[in-house]
Amino acid sequence: ASTQSPSVFPLTRCCKNIPSNATSVTLGCLATGYFPEPVMVTWDTGSLNGTTMTLPATTLTLSGHYATISLLTVSGAWAKQMFTCRVAHTPSSTDWVDNKTFSVCSRDFTPPTVKILQSSCDGGGHFPPTIQLLCLVSGYTPGTINITWLEDGQVMDVDLSTASTTQEGELASTQSELTLSQKHWLSDRTYTCQVTYQGHTFEDSTKKCADSNPRGVSAYLSRPSPFDLFIRKSPTITCLVVDLAPSKGTVNLTWSRASGKPVNHSTRKEEKQRNGTLTVTSTLPVGTRDWIEGETYQCRVTHPHLPRALMRSTTKTSGPRAAPEVYAFATPEWPGSRDKRTLACLIQNFMPEDISVQWLHNEVQLPDARHSTTQPRKTKGSGFFVFSRLEVTRAEWEQKDEFICRAVHEAASPSQTVQRAVSVNPGLAGGSAQSQRAPDRVLCHSGQQQGLPRAAGGSVPHPRCHCGAGRADWPGPPELDVCVEEAEGEAPWTWTGLC
């Protein structure tokens, strides 16, 4: 075994167990866990006479190290006297000594509770120049107490702290206040209030909480839309900062590129929200080729009242690519709304999730405000899907009963677009190269959270309608139920209601 210095422990009796008329009393010192032998134990008894006896060392079975006890018996006025047991272990080092000073007996005591409290921010929600940490040492039996402040385990300058003690009935409380600079506090150091009492150590520690985004301010950086990137060929990215408190001092949004190359001129917009916060957006035009080749763009947000800058970066999504499948459907006529129809477009199994959806009528792109498209959601597989919904009027379909749903996506070939045509009245439609016969089955979202019936006639499906596999060449994502209409007559299918 290698050389090991001893751990030293005082051995005392409980004061209440010593008779008040006792003329002598014995106390001890345990030195344990040392190797090799020997240890030398001496006692300082002050002015009192005492006899000492050191017991032979015993071997600790598991470690092979040694332990020994030295006993001191004193007589006379021992009650208030302090005694020092001095243990030397020369094999550890010639000057290795451990002193333990203690009284003859240990009183029952209530240990302190140690808790650190932190001063609050100033009125504006900012850190003041100095931060106060208050160490509350409460509820202990009155007695000598020692408070030390540590910074990352190192004893701090006493000049930083002040302490005061109060007694409440049988118990005492002490508080020590540490004044830290904002600099210290923000340096992510750990501060510990260490209390020594009755030979025991009690402590509590604290540090600045990690700030994800300062005081609820959030920044978002968008990628260019596939439409802007591949169709308009003028991609932009937008840095959006929300939940800013309107205040003096400018919010600065600064753009940079990871390559260090210069950035284009950005445009900025500020909007006061109804809840009193400020939203700032900065839009930066980026080069189509730069983006496609994987350039990284950074937006840095600074403000005098932000404790630190917010950084956001964006680049082309990495990972596997998959082109979207596009399916377009028309809803049947609904009682009471003969002059309106809803068209639906399911776009699925694409990767990555960036996609633009457009609707066209008469070869003209309809305004985005006309249709509503969901955010991309993951399929049960590895791809994504979206639904797009368009309301059309009788005037439109009577003018030309063909509407096109187009998806713009980087994996679509040859021109980053996939499109499908849909007619309100498929039997009457003239059709086109891109139009497609309505499927043998209707796809509808399985979620019935709207409480819609499964069929037009109520909660019971139409007798000729059943849920089934439908056509194998019309795959639907697992999120969709399938309702198959057993066709009669010439119409290949009819829609009797919602699944």
Epitope: H126, P128, P129, T179, S181, Q182, P307
Partner: antibody, heavy 114, light 110 residues
């Protein structure tokens, strides 16, 4: 001691990075600050970086300047420079435990001019 | 924002005399204040930190005092070599500050 890389003449709108290196002590153990002084003017605080790399800046900096560190250097990256940025730039070590700068570099002159 | 105001901007005294420079913080900074001496063409030199602690190698003629918001640097037994510009600096805050230094005081020794 501390030393800053040589300053130089920069045209308005240009960029420059100053590097601070140490000899005789390990830079990585200390918080560091950058301070500048325009000709004939007083000292002006630019920013501060903790030993762990957390940075804070004077409110006038407005993200034009960035302080960063490696295990052996502390850099001050300056962008969109204007003639008002003409000054001697100092790096300084915070070495007292009370936030004071006990060791300063000799300073390097940066001139922004057409 | 925390602002440091230093007065006077300039002070003149004879060799052997005493000068007093004041520094006021707009918010309490406890004792987180240091004083620097700067001579033309040189970097600043730390004189006093923690409001009143003398930096290594600084003569005891330099004395710092104060805490909270009011601080003073006193230079007694003035020597010709003391002619310089003196700056106070708050060492507490790093957020929302325009300058951590006072405006400086030029000391002229006659």
């Amino acid at each position: 001691s501390l030393g800053e890389s040589r300053g130089r003449l920069v045209t308005p709108g240009g960029s420059l990075t100053l590097t601070c290196t140490a000899s005789g002590f390990s830079l990585s153990s200390y918080a560091m600050g950058w301070v500048r002084q325009a000709p004939g003017k007083g000292l002006e605080y630019i920013g501060w970086i903790s030993a762990g790399g957390t940075t804070y800046y004077a409110s006038w900096v407005n993200s034009r300047f960035t302080i960063s560190r490696t295990s052996t250097t502390v850099d001050l990256e300056m962008t969109s420079l204007t003639t008002e940025d003409t000054a001697t730039y100092f790096c300084a070590r915070e070495g007292t435990g009370w936030g004071a700068y006990d060791i300063w570099g000799p300073g390097t002159l940066v001139t922004v001019s057409l | 924002a925390l602002v440091m105001t230093q007065t006077p901007a300039s002070v003149s005294a004879a060799v052997g005399g005493t000068v007093t420079i004041n520094c006021q913080a707009s918010q309490s900074i406890h004792k987180y204040l240091s004083w620097y001496q700067q001579k033309p063409g040189q970097p600043p030199k730390l004189l006093i930190y923690r409001a009143s602690t003398l930096a290594s190698g600084v003569p005891s003629r330099f004395k710092g005092s104060g805490s909270g918001t009011q601080f003073t640097l006193t230079i007694s037994d003035l020597e010709c070599d003391d002619a310089a510009t003196y700056y106070c600096q708050q060492d507490a805050a790093v957020i929302s500050i325009d300058n951590s230094f006072g405006g400086g005081t030029e000391v002229v020794v006659k």
